[in-house]
Each structure stands twice: as C-alpha cells, then as structure tokens.
Amino acid sequence: QGWQAFKNDATEIIPELGEYPEPPPELENNKTMNRAENGGRPPHHPFETKDVSEYSCRELHFTRYVTDGPCRSAKPVTELVCSGQCGPARLLPNAIGRGKWWRPSGPDFRCIPDRYRAQRVQLLCPGGEAPRARKVRLVASCKCKRLTRFHNQSELKDFGTEAARPQKGRKPRPRARSAKANQAELENAY
C-alpha cells in the first residue's frame, strides 16, 4: 500500500513538559493576590507567609491517542496535565503607580509531575499488520516542587517513555511533531 512513506504526524507518545501551554485564564485558580497586601511592597520572605500548597497546582485531565507513524492506539489514554501557579507572584509599583506582577527571583516552585503510571496500549496499524503493544508513561499526579537553577532542567525533562525510546534493531523514528502542534493539541484538553 506504500504507507512506509507516511509522515510521522503522531502525537508524541509523551510530550515534553515544556510543550504544555499555559492554561487559559478561566482555568486559573480564582484565588488572586490582594493587590494591597504588604502595602504594595514585596515581603522579606515571600515563602514564609503562605504555605506553597495554598497556591494553585491544578491537575487537568487530558485525553489523547497514542500514535506511532501510521499506527494509533485502539483507545485514547487519559493523563494529567500539570498547570497553575506555585508560590506568590510579587507586586512592585511601577513608575506611574500602577501595580506590576513579577516572579520572585528566589526559590522557584513549579507545578510539575509528581508521580507517573505505566499503561500498556495496543497500537493498531494499517495493511493487516499485527497490533503492537506499547507501554507508555503517563502523569498520575502533580505537585508544587521547589526547583533550584541547578536541577531545573533535569526535573522538567523527566518525561520519558518506554514507547518513545527506540527499540533494539530499529531505527528511531524522527520526531516530526513540533512543539507548536503539540500545544494546539493540548489546548483542546481544557
């Protein structure tokens, strides 16, 4: 049938965390910082006054198919997308007196995956090819985690999957799915 030439247009079996979009405004926690808090001045110890758990680290369900080349999972998988603000944004007055939000330069708390779960999926392929079994690693819970600049990148990139890794004796497939395409796909989850 000539399907070897199929463009690898698949949803990444697990997308990079950095490819998740910011949630739309209506999904943000309704709890907003009081603009008059601390008289408009930043607190001396921004993370001492409020427990980090008070800030919004949302777990949003996202349903998608696992695809690999021309093959698609028989059923979609549902995983969590971690979203939201961890830790207070600080308020500084600008030159003309209106408030301005900015992120603290101290410890960086991020809403990121906390636990993962493995799920076996069956990939159905064209041309009468036998179904393929794949194990995917899906986000099971989210948490506000304190990240230092030192381990920032390694934490955020900890998002691999057995299915995404090339198997022995097989050439790895090119990752044709762009971050932009993944973002569009994820935006529909909300």
Epitope: K75, T78, P126, G127, A189
Partner: antibody, heavy 119, light 110 residues
Framework: CQSVEESGGRLVTPGTPLTLTCTVS????????MYWVRQAPGKGLEYIGF?????AVSYATWAKGRFTISRTSTTVDLKITSPTTEDTATYFC???????????????WGPGTLVTVSS | AYDMTQTPASVEVAVGGTVTIKCQAS??????LAWYQQKPGQPPKLLIY???TLASGVSSRFKGSGYGTQFTLTISGVECADAATYYC????????????FGGGTEVVVK
C-alpha cells in the same frame, strides 16, 4: 438487539439549559465509547464530542464550554449549557462499532431528538 | 486541523451506473476513515470503516479505498435505494478538532 435512543429534545428559549439523554439497551455502556453528533435542518453532520469514562471526555473545539457530556451506568447525557438559536438541530447519540476501538465507525445510531431554540 | 473535504457536493448518476465520491483529509489519517449513508429523516448508517472494510450487512457494491489524505467511496451498479447523502469521518485524532465529518455528498439517482 443493541440499540440507542435519544430523548429530551423540545422547544426551549435561548439561555435555558437543556439536557438530552441517550438510553442504551442490549449492551453495557462500560464497554463502549458514546458520541454525540448533531445536524441542523438541511445541513451536514457536526461532531460534538464523546465520552469513554468519567475522566475521558473529549469535545470538538467549538463545543467546549457550550456542552457537557456525562454518563451513568445506563445513560449518556448531553447538557446544552446556554442554548442559542444556532443550536437548533437534531441531536444524535451513537456508539462505537467495536467496544475495543474508539472512533472507528459509529454503529448503532439513535433516531435523533429535535431541539428547537427560539424566543 | 484534520479537516475533511468531500467532493463533489452533489452528483447525478443513472441506475446501473457507477459513482465515485472523494474525501480529502488536511493531514494524514492513515486508514482511520469511515463512510456513512444518510437518507432524509433517518440517522446515518455505517457503510465502511478503516477506509476499506465493509460494515456488517452492507452490499459489496460499496467499496472504500485510500490511505493517508486521499480516500474514495465507489458505488457500482447504482440502485434507486442508493439515493442519499454520504459522509466521510476521520478517526485518527480527537484533539483540536472542529468536525470529524466531511461536508457530505448528495447522490441523486436518475
């Protein structure tokens, strides 16, 4: 005999929420994905969304926020949150052809239920 | 994303003739395509799934083919009962989708 049937369609005024119900017989809902599709008078088929489980629900981009799909052990509901005149259509409920595979042909379909939104 | 375009919008065919309906996907959908027949006042009826597999109880006069972005439904030995509107439906992706169905093709039998 496996069948699905929609109910709840009626004349409503704009902004009045309306819930349509799809009742199934001859098969277990837990084994299948269920879909909602609508068809405005004289127009084509328009996909609204589907439900696989309580957490696995997906909507067409235009339907997000306008519709809510939920299910019980024997029924699938479609809530039109704030109907407008553009939501006037026949609403169909359909099941996956094969319980093991979603979005792989819908069969059976219900006969449809007509929703008219008018002031 | 994954928009489905059907051509022609309407076609006339004589009894006994052959009619071909095309469906084009804006992005490759492998073989995840179904075809439906709908008559006025009735729900759609599944004809073909996975691009070329005939649904249960459907006449072998209906034939589906295609892969990737280009698909075809061919009806041979057309009968009066084939007068209907035909729709294609993609089954590859559920995210960022406006509609999984094509716009429909009306088949008029003379």
């Amino acid at each position: 005999c496996q069948s699905v049937e929609e109910s709840g369609g009626r004349l409503v005024t704009p902004g009045t929420p309306l819930t349509l119900t799809c009742t199934v017989s001859g098969f277990s809902l837990s084994s299948y994905s269920m879909y909602w599709v609508r068809q405005a008078p004289g127009k084509g088929l328009e996909y609204i969304g589907f439900i696989l489980s309580a957490t696995a629900v997906s909507y067409a981009t235009w339907a997000k926020g306008r519709f809510t799909i939920s299910r019980t052990s024997t029924t699938v509901d479609l809530k039109i949150t704030s109907p407008t005149t553009e939501d006037t259509a026949t609403y169909f409920c359909a099941r996956d052809r094969d319980g093991g595979t979603t979005l792989d042909g819908f069969d059976p379909w219900g006969p449809g239920t007509l929703v008219t939104v008018s002031s | 994303a994954y928009d489905m375009t059907q051509t022609p919008a309407s076609v006339e065919v004589a009894v006994g003739g052959t009619v071909t309906i095309k469906c084009q996907a804006s992005e490759s959908i492998s073989t995840w395509l179904a075809w439906y027949q709908q008559k006025p006042g009735q729900p759609p009826k599944l004809l073909i799934y996975r691009a070329s597999t005939l649904a249960s109880g459907v006449s072998s006069r209906f034939k589906g083919s295609g892969y990737g972005t280009q698909f075809t439904l061919t009806i041979s030995g057309v009968e009066c009962a084939d007068a209907a509107t035909y729709y294609c439906q993609q089954g590859w992706n559920i995210n960022n989708i406006d509609n999984i169905f094509g716009g429909g093709t009306e088949v008029v039998v003379k």
